[in-house]
Amino acid sequence: EPTMYGEILSPNYPQAYPSEVEKSWDIEVPEGYGIHLYFTHLDIELSENCAYDSVQIISGDTEEGRLCGQRSSNNPHSPIVEEFQVPYNKLQVIFKSDFSNEERFTGFAAYYVATDINECTDFVDVPCSHFCNNFIGGYFCSCPPEYFLHDDMKNCGVNCSGDVFTALIGEIASPNYPKPYPENSRCEYQIRLEKGFQVVVTLRREDFDVEAADSAGNCLDSLVFVAGDRQFGPYCGHGFPGPLNIETKSNALDIIFQTDLTGQKKGWKLRYHGDPMPCPKEDTPNSVWEPAKAKYVFRDVVQITCLDGFEVVEGRVGATSFYSTCQSNGKWSNSKLKCQPVDCGIPESIENGKVEDPESTLFGSVIRYTCEEPYYYMENGGGGEYHCAGNGSWVNEVLGPELPKCVPVCGVPREPFEEKQRIIGGSDADIKNFPWQVFFDNPWAGGALINEYWVLTAAHVVEGNREPTMYVGSTSVQTSRLAKSKMLTPEHVFIHPGWKLLEVPEGRTNFDNDIALVRLKDPVKMGPTVSPICLPGTSSDYNLMDGDLGLISGWGRTEKRDRAVRLKAARLPVAPLRKCKEVKVEKPTADAEAYVFTPNMICAGGEKGMDSCKGDSGGAFAVQDPNDKTKFYAAGLVSWGPQCGTYGLYTRVKNYVDWIMKTMQENSTPRED
């Protein structure tokens, strides 16, 4: 705890001090005081440099004195034999004695008192910039008129800060300009303009005279301009050394004028004004600017429109133009937006066709769709070539953005049917000869695939089972083969409205309109063993003449078996209807006259015993297309017959083309469209 005074005595004083002692006293007086230390008695063993016994006085790191021997006062009126005056408030006194004393020494008696120090004069460094005032225990600084004392309570300066200039034009000068500026001051001026305007400072060389730089080039007095993170200056010297026109690119400018204690000059004067912030005329590729101007400034708005085939993508939305505003910071809004080539994206896939992975999906790229040939062809034309259009769609010259449609090729077997060894009036066949052949397992019968979703068959096949199970793609109807083939699931059966439904179908004598359509749940995938047969055209070219040849196929009854294991086929000629009428019905269920013969029936067969039989019903009587010899069309459907191995009757499909087309159209699905 600091004290104002105190006494220090050597050990055992006034008796002799002991040997081998080291003792120290830390003296502390209050802040703002010095210490006056004086000895009234000194009797310590004398030695050179007081090396044996001594009393040492230390101030900080400085040894103020080292005492030994005997002293007496020079002044009869004063008891002081030695004294020290330090301008600090702390002092250390250390007493040391060695291991032996030749005589008896009594040591010392000392006293200290706190004394006032004159901070204004006692130190090399003057504590105040202008006036220094001492008082007991301290000092204070004061300033001349028009100066004020800074927060450090030591330095005086003029009150030249705090001015904020908001007008778009103005003039600022150093204090007292053109008289000498005050020393030891820091003047800060702020220019704050509305956002969107930049501060432009103009000076004349002759309006600037500030104390010059020292030999190292450092300004002693300086003028600095700070605009955001940009700094102009420091400037000093006679005549303004910087640019006479300073474009700050900022609406906020701080002017800092710093002076030292010496060398006052006349100072400086400047003008400023606010310029609307300019925005650069940027080069935005693949676009045009509207309006086009040589210079754009704050608040200007331009519409940037992409050239055809380019778009601006923001998020997931594509647009052909955007607006950009010259902002207060001198930057364009929406500057990240760019006109990029339109991307049409990965082209949509199509059923039963493919599109090669394009190298590019950008504007101008070309892709080609192809159908899975030879089983599908492009129905809606257009050649399959699409280019990436400016609107971001893949476009075909004929179809526009509509996708090509791959539809099954009809009537073309993968392998032509060749009559081999004759088996029961027919030959072994392969499903590839008759890829349209459909097998019905209950009742055992046939049908003809006419497109992806539809099977044509005889009405009498499905009248008793409206949910038939059908198979395609297999030559053999052995269980193991059917398990590997494609099973077709019906969605709905459509029997011709002219077909008369009977309570006892076994006794039927009227097979007029023996035709039905089965709509499938799922589309059939075409291939070498599954492919549709064509329908007849409506022109007279498709009117059959006697002797025209047609092919029949099926797994019906043969001479050896009730049901064929593998597909059988035969080539039959068309015969006059009377030939069928003339054959005696094998197992008549009524009078021969009761059997109905109509123009909706085709009579065929009678040659080499080739005929269709029980189990072949619903299969196609396939005839070569008169207008395209590579194709077959379903001229007839196996319907009924008087006797196997003679002549058979077939539903004349040409008479039902309108009904077939209407039924399919009315019962198509969006998928199919």
Epitope: F439, S476, T479, S480, A483, R561
Partner: antibody
């Protein structure tokens, strides 16, 4: 009427081979697919394999692969099944069976041939 | 090869009972499943094919159902002639396989 007539019972020693025949009458072998099935005494039915005329290949159950050979002589309408490296657990009745149509797996069964493997 | 698992292995029932036998395939076999009845010393007799189609001449008290991997054979009212062993058989893959059998015996 189609019939399958199998060869008579056989007694074989372990390690030996047995060849069972199955003659088709009333139809031609080319129109049929012949399968072979066996049944050990008091045990279940085991499908052994078949000749697939469509693919022209013989398919065997994995269990018998490498030990069984199925052949056909179309001139005599006879099918054969030969099993080699016989062991006691091969003692069983061996049936030839024709494949059915339109989902029916087996149509016609032979009368069966008992093969006994005993040392 | 596809594994066929029948349950139960043995079933004790009385005349007139409704009996259900289950067959599970190790992978989907669609509806390519048949059920056979076998009596001692006789060749198996086909009851059901394609999972639910009744073979001609088989009494209507026998019925089959299921598709994919789960199948059942049901005898609606057990008759004295029905005490036998029943097998399921898959014919989806060309490597056909049988179940291990279910013996239906008199309770």
């Amino acid at each position: 009427q189609v019939q399958l007539v199998q060869s008579g019972a056989e007694v074989k020693k372990p390690g030996a081979s047995v060849k069972v025949s199955c003659k088709v009458s009333g139809d031609t072998l080319t129109e049929l697919s012949m399968h072979w099935v066996r049944q050990a005494p008091g045990k279940g039915l085991e499908w052994m394999g078949t000749f697939d005329p469509e693919e022209g290949e013989t398919i065997y159950a994995q269990k018998f692969q490498g030990r069984v050979t199925m052949t056909e002589d179309t001139s005599t309408d006879t099918a054969y099944m030969e099993l080699s490296s016989l062991r006691s657990e091969d003692t069983a009745v061996y049936y030839c069976v024709t494949e059915g149509l339109a989902g029916v797996p087996f149509d016609l069964w032979g009368q069966g041939t008992l093969v006994t493997v005993s040392s | 090869d596809i594994q066929m698992t029948q349950s139960p292995s043995t079933l004790s029932a009385s005349v007139g009972d409704r009996v259900t036998i289950t067959c599970r395939a190790s992978q989907s076999i669609s509806s390519w499943l048949a059920w056979y009845q076998q009596k001692p010393g006789k060749a198996p007799k086909l009851l059901i094919y394609k999972a639910s189609s009744l073979e001609s001449g088989v009494p209507s008290r026998f019925s089959g159902s299921g598709s994919g991997t789960e199948f059942t054979l049901t005898i609606s009212s057990l008759q004295p002639d029905d005490f036998a062993t029943y097998y399921c058989q898959q014919h989806n893959s060309y490597r056909w396989t049988f179940g291990q059998g279910t013996k239906v015996e008199i309770k």
